[in-house]
């Protein structure tokens, strides 16, 4: 273990007005999963709905790059490669945990938060509004 | 802010042996997400590889729930209806961290892991293997 | 097992392009999981990373500040190798360059696997 | 650009005895981005930790990592006649941010 050196200004443990804070020890277990995960194999490649992933970076948050998926077409891929428009190609989206530094610059003061990703891309049917 | 309860044997912030350990705040903010998302609306319906949600609940876990997609089919719905199984319905996986409890029961005292969810399905052209 | 097996020369004349080869075996240049770089090492600079490359349904292109203006990395997909071009050369660019897998699993960043290493010197 | 400085240059021990190997950064930098190699005369480096504490794999249990924000320590808890080499941390900030230390020689006393 290490002693944690206390930086001016960061807040410490024992401040009973410290909001909602816990102790969190940063050595991540893998659970269900390799060290080195084939993310998704290559189906934005094979999908009926591809996409595109594009890096998301930002050195203050972990995890720093994550990789978002944008869909390539508005409609969906047929079987002879051209795009079918009477279907719909939608991202697949999903909130994850990141942390970020707060106060930023505190080595050992974090701050959890919630965002909203695109995993990949989806075919569905659309949704047709009848006006009467 | 609230005073944080002592469980004996939970570790507590001034332990110097408590390994990596650093200060969380769970007020968490919610970036470009609202805090109940309509989980990617009901694509698991209307996708030509629809799948199903299974609620994964671990009371030692934050978050306590999390839906797993489990694909509905092998193969992908074709407009009428009826299964193709020359094309295959496949999860698409994305590596997530969330908060356990450690020790267990511990009401303010967290590991990180990392966890494989699917978070929803999408329709792929199968890569076949030919045989010499 | 992966491995990494580096060629080219060993002597490039100043103001000329520096040349070397990265084949990958056990392991696809394309991996969505990984990313392919070089790193050299001098007495004088110690280790210095170069660049990457990396495959997220495009190439990515990733070169360090110092050497941004002279550097290339390219995949060859057919042979499942990537190459380094150092553009310009000086005498301060001899070193022994290493090319290496970097695990790029969104959560970690590290260099798991290295090439032998070859040492490039940079005279007339 | 995060400068790491490691400390000592040089550690002169006894086979036995413990190495305590310290690597400090300019400014914080994510432990989960930051690894430890091994690197001994003619030969390139060795991964030994990755994310400041976790060992690579075949890394034997005498090898441990620990530190978070700017200051991250390597420790040999009992040193074996082939751990003698140069030791170096390196960081990852950003996709154009990544350096490495000048290193740590570990040699025999």
């Known amino acids: 273990g290490i002693a944690i050196p206390r930086n001016s200004g960061c807040p410490n443990s024992e401040d009973k007005n410290f909001p909602r804070t816990v102790m969190v020890n940063l050595n991540i277990h893998n659970r269900n999963t390799s060290t080195n995960p084939k993310r998704s194999s290559d189906y934005y490649n094979r999908s009926t709905s591809p996409w595109n992933l594009h890096r998301n970076e930002d050195p203050e948050r972990y995890p720093s790059v994550i990789w978002e998926a944008k869909c390539r077409h508005l409609g969906c891929v047929k079987a002879d490669g051209n795009v079918d428009y009477h279907m719909n190609s939608v991202p697949i989206q999903q909130e994850i945990l990141v942390l970020r530094r707060e106060p930023r610059h505190c080595p050992n003061s974090f701050r959890l938060e919630k965002i909203l990703v695109s995993v990949g891309c989806t075919c569905v049917t659309p949704i047709v509004h009848h006006v009467a | 802010g609230i005073a944080i309860p002592r469980n004996s044997g939970c570790p507590n912030s001034e332990d110097k042996n408590f390994p990596r350990t650093v200060m969380v705040n769970l007020n968490i903010h919610n970036r470009n997400t609202s805090t109940n998302p309509k989980r990617s609306s009901d694509y698991y319906n209307r996708s030509t590889s629809p799948w199903n949600l299974h609620r994964n609940e671990d009371p030692e876990r934050y978050p306590s729930v999390i839906w797993e997609a489990k694909c509905r089919h092998l193969g992908c719905v074709k407009a009428d209806g009826n299964v193709d199984y020359h094309m295959n319905s496949v999860p698409i996986q994305q590596e997530i961290l969330v908060l356990r409890r450690e020790p267990r029961h511990c009401p303010n005292s967290f590991r990180l892991e990392k966890i494989l969810v699917s978070v929803g399905c999408t329709c792929v052209t199968p890569i076949v293997h030919h045989v010499a | 097992q992966v491995q990494l097996q580096q060629s080219g020369p060993g002597l490039v004349k100043p103001s000329q392009t520096l040349s070397l080869t990265c084949a990958i075996s056990?392991?696809?240049?394309?991996?969505?999981?990984?990313?392919w770089g070089w790193i050299r090492q001098s007495p004088s600079r110690g280790l210095e990373w170069l660049g990457r490359?990396?495959?997220?349904?495009?190439?990515?292109?990733d070169y360090a500040v110092s050497v941004k203006s002279r550097i290339t990395i390219n995949p060859d997909t057919s042979k499942n190798q990537f190459s380094l071009q150092l553009n310009s050369v000086t005498p301060e660019d001899t070193a022994v360059y290493y090319c290496?897998?970097?695990?790029?699993?969104?959560?970690?960043?590290?260099?798991?696997?290295w090439g032998q290493g070859t040492l490039v010197t940079v005279s007339s | 650009e995060i400068v790491l400085t490691q400390s000592p240059a040089t550690l002169s021990l006894s086979p036995g005895e413990r190495a305590t190997l310290s690597c400090r950064a300019s400014?914080?930098?994510?432990?989960?981005?930051l690894a430890w190699y091994q690197q001994k005369p003619g030969q390139a480096p060795r991964l030994l930790i990755y994310?400041?504490?976790n060992r690579a794999t075949g890394i034997p249990a005498r090898f441990s990592g620990s530190g978070s924000g700017t200051d991250f320590t390597l420790t040999i808890s009992s040193l074996e006649p082939e751990d003698f080499a140069v030791y170096y941390c390196?960081?990852?900030?950003?996709?154009?941010?990544?350096?490495f230390g000048q290193g740590t020689k570990v040699e025999i006393k």
């Open positions: 290496a897998r970097e695990v790029d699993s969104m959560y970690y960043s590290y260099f798991d696997i």
């Open positions: 400014q914080n930098v994510w432990a989960f981005y």
């Open positions: 994310g400041a504490s």
């Open positions: 056990g392991d696809s240049v394309s991996s969505s999981s990984a990313a």
């Open positions: 490359i990396s495959y997220r349904s495009k190439w990515y292109n």
């Open positions: 390196q960081q990852y900030r950003s996709t154009l941010s990544l350096t």
